[in-house]
């Protein structure tokens, strides 16, 4: 007994085509490009039916339905716009991703995606993953570089990368991207095995204010070349936050130095240090303070720290010094881990050139200088940690 002649579903065809189909004969259904085999909501890669001895097919005809890529995934810190038409998500539909202006910029591709025949939203470069809205770094309400101890009060948006680190001693750090904090190894050394003990606060000027954005640490990475209680070489650490922070005018990451950044960090170039460390009155600052200080010739700095009580070789090639020969302007205890920043006049973005590390016991002392970890020496280390974790 022959089986009923198989009528191809719309947008599909039957193969092989025969005059009649008898016991054990079979046919397959193939869909046109942009259409897929579906049995209800369940997708099929292939479909073959076999003629049974009672003259019926062993399974019902599927549909060739237009491929539907479904609603596109939400883009963190961005949005999606339907280009083809409101809510259209079927084959050849186009959508456009964009990032929240000012504070984020799109990485990976141009954000235009098309619903392809395989059912995935695909960029013009062939990527099926979402684009990335990366925080814009180095934005500040302060537009000039140049002219804490001997410092001035910061205003909202001046140092939006500034991070207050509690959980042990008071220290500082600088936001990188939206889920990393750059700081000094000595500031977080005690918490390296207990990252969750770090209380990380940002988006505030007042050290004791109850109004701040709270972040918590997921992991602490201390440079493997740092030896606690044996000098300050490689005094650098990264804290990975357990969540991304929302970027705004009061919370913005600092840029890492470009290869060309050394041209903005020559002797006498002005950097800016900020923090809540000790002021001239000998107390931790209530309000975030900042000080503009010039870079000091490396040999001059080395010489300043060659005499007792400082051991020979205290100042290494991984450090840079800043301050006035006459003293009075410096970072101090409590500022540790904070960023010494410089304005890149080509990109008009601020970048971190140094990390507050160490100095003389008497902050702002004449003939002594603040010593900072030279960040440009650690770019490969920073990039490796961030890409691996």
């Amino acid at each position: 007994q022959p089986c009923p002649y198989p009528m191809a579903p719309p947008n599909g065809h039957v193969s092989p085509v025969q005059a009649k189909y008898i016991l054990k004969d079979s046919f397959s259904i193939f869909c046109e490009t942009g259409y897929e085999l579906l049995q209800g909501h369940l997708p099929l890669k292939s479909f073959t039916a076999v003629c049974q001895k009672d003259g019926s097919w062993d399974r019902p005809m599927p549909a060739c339905s237009i491929v539907d890529c479904g609603p596109p995934d939400d883009l963190p810190s961005g949005r999606v716009e339907y280009i083809t038409g409101p809510g259209v998500t079927t084959y050849k539909a186009v959508i456009q991703y964009s990032c929240e202006e000012t504070f984020y910029t799109m990485k990976v591709n141009d954000g235009k995606y098309v619903c392809e025949a395989d059912g995935f939203w695909t960029s013009s470069k062939g990527e099926k993953s979402l684009p990335v809205c990366e925080p814009v770094c180095g934005l500040s309400a302060r537009t000039t570089g140049g002219r804490i101890y001997g410092g001035q009060k910061a205003k909202p948006g001046d140092f939006p990368w500034q991070v207050l680190i509690l959980g042990g001693t008071t220290a500082a750090g600088a936001l990188l991207y939206d889920n990393w904090v750059l700081t000094a190894a000595h500031a977080v050394y005690e918490q390296k095995h207990d990252a969750s003990a770090l209380d990380i606060r940002m988006g505030t000027l007042k050290r004791l204010s109850p109004h701040y954005t709270q972040a918590w640490s997921e992991a602490v990475f201390i440079h493997e070349g740092y030896t606690h209680d044996a000098g300050f070489d490689n005094d650098i650490a990264l804290i990975k936050l357990n969540n991304k922070v929302v970027i705004n005018s009061n919370i913005t990451p600092i840029c890492l130095p470009r290869k060309e950044a050394e041209s903005f960090m020559r002797t006498d170039d002005i950097g800016t240090a900020s923090g809540w460390g000790l002021t001239q009155r000998g107390f931790l600052a209530r309000n975030l303070m900042y000080v503009d200080i010039p870079i000091v010739d490396h040999q001059k700095c080395t010489a300043a720290y060659e005499k007792p009580p400082y051991p020979r070789g205290s100042v290494t090639a991984n450090m840079l010094c800043a301050g006035l020969e006459s003293g009075g302007k410096d970072s101090c205890r409590g500022d540790s881990g904070g960023a010494l920043v410089f304005l890149d006049s080509e990109t008009e973005r601020w970048f971190v050139g140094g990390i507050v590390s160490w100095g003389s016991m008497n902050c702002g002392e004449a003939g002594q200088y603040g010593v900072y970890t030279k960040v440009i020496n650690y770019i490969p280390w920073i990039e490796n940690i961030i890409s691996d974790f």
Epitope: Q39, G40, H41, L42, P43, L44, K45, S46, R59, P60, G70, D118, G119, F120
Partner: antibody, heavy 115, light 107 residues
Framework: EVQLQESGPGLVKPSQTLSLTCTVS?????????WNWIRQPPGNKLEWMGY???????SYNPSLKSRITISRDTSKNQFSLKLSSVTAADTAVYYC????????WGQGTTVTVSS | DIQMTQSPSSLSASVGDRVTITCKAS??????VAWYQQKPGKVPKALIY???YRYSGVPSRFSGSGSGTDFTLTISSLQPEDVATYYC?????????FGQGTKLEIK
């Protein structure tokens, strides 16, 4: 013969993420069909959670969409379920299954959400 | 979501009886309906797919019919091993949904 086997912790704390893996033998998950997760709370009816298709596309129950992720590891012929922010209401027997023309289910694994 | 409403919620019948379980969909599901049998403490076992197609190995006493919104599972001659809970399921649209179950017992 096609076989599916669920694996994962039997106890999950509230607010944590439930993670289960389904290992498939006797059939490649990239060959065809939709590979599903279905659960059954104690004394209750079955609830479809979502699937990952042969091509890697996913479809989720809208009631779980903000919490569920189904992924696969084709090299191990496995597909996995992650359900975040669990509560006591997520206590159930969890099954992996391939439905429709090929219909096979795992034996099920009981997951209890409790502190 | 498409609701699948089974009736009765439980029933008791004698060995050899003809048993009918019905399932009503809240909207058209074409013939994209499956029937499952679940014995206590066991995994659901598929009996029928596409409303009327029996899985291989399923006894011929089990049959399914219907399309659109009304579906029926029939056991032509009830056997002692058929004691179980039976579920209908629609796979026509997202989310796939199951009926609340029909518990079948032997008198």
């Amino acid at each position: 013969e096609v076989q599916l086997q669920e694996s994962g912790p039997g106890l999950v704390k509230p607010s944590q993420t439930l993670s289960l893996t389904c290992t498939v033998s006797g059939y490649s998950i990239t060959s065809d069909y939709a590979w599903n997760w279905i659960r059954q709370p104690p004394g209750n009816k079955l609830e479809w959670m979502g699937y990952i298709s042969y091509s890697g596309r996913t479809s989720y129950n809208p009631s779980l969409k903000s919490r569920i992720t189904i992924s696969r590891d084709t090299s191990k012929n496995q597909f996995s379920l992650k359900l975040s922010s669990v509560t006591a209401a997520d206590t159930a027997v969890y099954y992996c299954a391939v439905l429709y023309a090929l219909d096979y289910w795992g034996q099920g694994t009981t997951v209890t959400v409790s502190s | 979501d498409i609701q699948m409403t089974q009736s009765p919620s439980s029933l008791s019948a004698s060995v050899g009886d003809r048993v009918t379980i019905t399932c009503k969909a809240s909207q058209n599901v074409d013939t994209n309906v499956a029937w499952y049998q679940q014995k206590p403490g066991k995994v659901p076992k598929a009996l029928i797919y596409s409303a009327s197609y029996r899985y291989s190995g399923v006894p011929s006493r089990f049959s399914g019919s219907g399309s659109g919104t009304d579906f029926t599972l029939t056991i032509s001659s009830l056997q002692p091993e058929d004691v179980a809970t039976y579920y209908c399921q629609q796979y026509n649209s997202n989310p796939l949904t199951f009926g609340q179950g029909t518990k079948l017992e032997i008198k």
